[in-house]
């Protein structure tokens, strides 16, 4: 009988660690952000790109904020971050303004304590996009692991945003907490 | 549609400088190279060269460096064209044009006749 | 720069035949797998107006009549069946390399 009542009380400390830890997991922080295809600025100048998606598609976002174009930490910890950004053309749209583009991203890391901002990733390449192909396209893709406080933020800087590939599976960024500071 | 008025005529002096205007409409201005070509009277097309709207990018031919000067205005989305030190040799229709969403140059000005007479 | 000679300078085509213009490049005007030259019509006080562009695609409105061929130097604008409102000057063109250029023109008068 004891043994019964021993088991029986494992199983029930066993749901509650399962609980726990689900609930524990349901806490953990991630975001993973799409580009918004409305609000990309113009031009070939290196810019901030403040305008993501959070809740439709794939994007999704949980325990952590956007705002103002920035992904902010609400839970200290060490977070892996990641950003892939994809450039096109194809000649119906227009015409290059030139034929040697610098194309890149820089993943940045702000503090508002103290306030600083720092680089956290950079991918990219010098391109020749010959005005004479009918089709361009160019992939970069950055992750990295990274220790992160409460209340800094993430944002994302291109060069060439007008020619950015508007699609969700093509331009985002997100980030998901691996495990607490010690 | 793709639209683009030119200037009206110019009669100016041997010496003297012309400003001719492309005003564009029915497209983003920024977005696409405008060209100029000069066409004297009875005589073939000559490119001179050609506008990048947005940053103000500009290309050449060789003959026409040191003659035309091309700016754009892009919030009034008019590309211009100055010619300078005018001889009789000026003398001709100038076009605007832009290519279409393939290649080839699908859209033209209406064209503007300057004439260089003492 | 690429130079585009055109012949015949001018042409005398009677109403229902055929015409044929040429248009030879100084040096190759291919590349990416495409031809970068286009034909023109211009008649007399108007601008001219694009007919065939990259070679052999005809562009939007333009009468069936009216086809190119040809790759790397060597052009052909044919007019199947010439009727009366095809008299006018044809020119070649080649947005392949800066400076873009034009060929000479050539006259076509209908009998």
């Known amino acids: 009988g004891s043994q019964h009542i021993r088991a029986e009380k494992a199983m029930v400390d066993g749901s509650w660690l399962d609980l726990a830890k689900r609930s524990k997991l349901e806490a953990q922080p991630f975001a993973h952000l799409t580009i918004n295809a409305t609000d990309i600025p113009s031009g070939s100048h290196k810019v901030s790109l403040s305008s993501w998606y959070h809740d439709r598609g794939w994007a999704k976002i949980s325990n952590m904020t956007f705002s103002n174009g920035k992904l902010i930490v609400n839970q200290d910890g060490f977070y892996y971050l990641y950003a892939n950004i994809c450039f096109r053309h194809h000649e119906t749209s227009g015409d290059l303004a030139t034929e040697y583009l610098q194309l890149m991203v820089y993943v940045t890391k702000t503090s508002i304590k103290i306030p600083s901002s720092h680089t956290l990733m950079k991918g990219g390449s010098t391109k020749y996009w010959s005005g004479n192909s009918e089709f361009h396209f160019y992939s970069i893709n950055v992750g990295g692991f990274f220790k992160l406080r409460s209340g800094e933020e993430i944002s994302i800087e291109v060069s060439n945003p007008s020619l950015l590939d508007p699609d969700q599976d093509a331009t985002y960024f997100g980030a998901f907490k691996v495990r607490d500071i010690d | 549609q793709v639209q683009l008025q030119q200037s009206g005529a110019e009669l100016a002096s041997p010496g003297a400088s012309v400003k001719l205007s492309c005003k564009a409409s029915g497209y983003t201005f920024t977005t696409y190279w405008l060209q100029w070509v000069k066409q004297r009277p009875g005589q073939g097309l000559e490119w001179i060269g050609a506008i990048y709207p947005g940053p103000g990018n500009t290309k050449y031919t060789q003959k026409f460096k040191d003659k035309a000067t091309l700016t754009a205005d892009k919030s009034a989305s008019t590309a211009y064209m100055q010619l300078n030190s005018l001889t009789s040799e000026d003398s001709a229709v100038y076009y605007c044009a832009r290519r279409g969403s393939r290649r080839g140059i699908a859209y033209w000005g209406q064209g503007t006749l300057v004439t260089v007479s003492a | 720069n690429i130079v585009l000679t055109q012949s015949p300078a001018s042409l005398s085509v009677s109403l229902g035949q055929r015409a044929t213009i040429s248009c030879r490049a100084s040096?190759?005007?291919?590349?990416?797998?495409?031809?970068?030259m286009h034909w023109y019509q211009q008649r007399p006080g108007q601008a001219p107006k694009l007919l065939i562009y990259?070679?052999?695609n005809l562009e939007s409105g333009v009468p069936a009549r009216f086809s190119g061929s040809g790759s790397r130097t060597d052009f052909t604008l044919t007019i199947s069946s010439v009727e009366a409102e095809d008299e006018a000057t044809y020119y070649c063109?080649?947005?392949?390399?800066?400076?873009?250029?034009f060929g000479g023109g050539t006259k076509l008068e209908i009998k």
């Open positions: 990259l070679a052999s």
């Open positions: 063109q080649q947005d392949n390399e800066d400076p873009y250029t």
């Open positions: 040096e190759s005007v291919d590349s990416y797998g495409r031809s970068f």
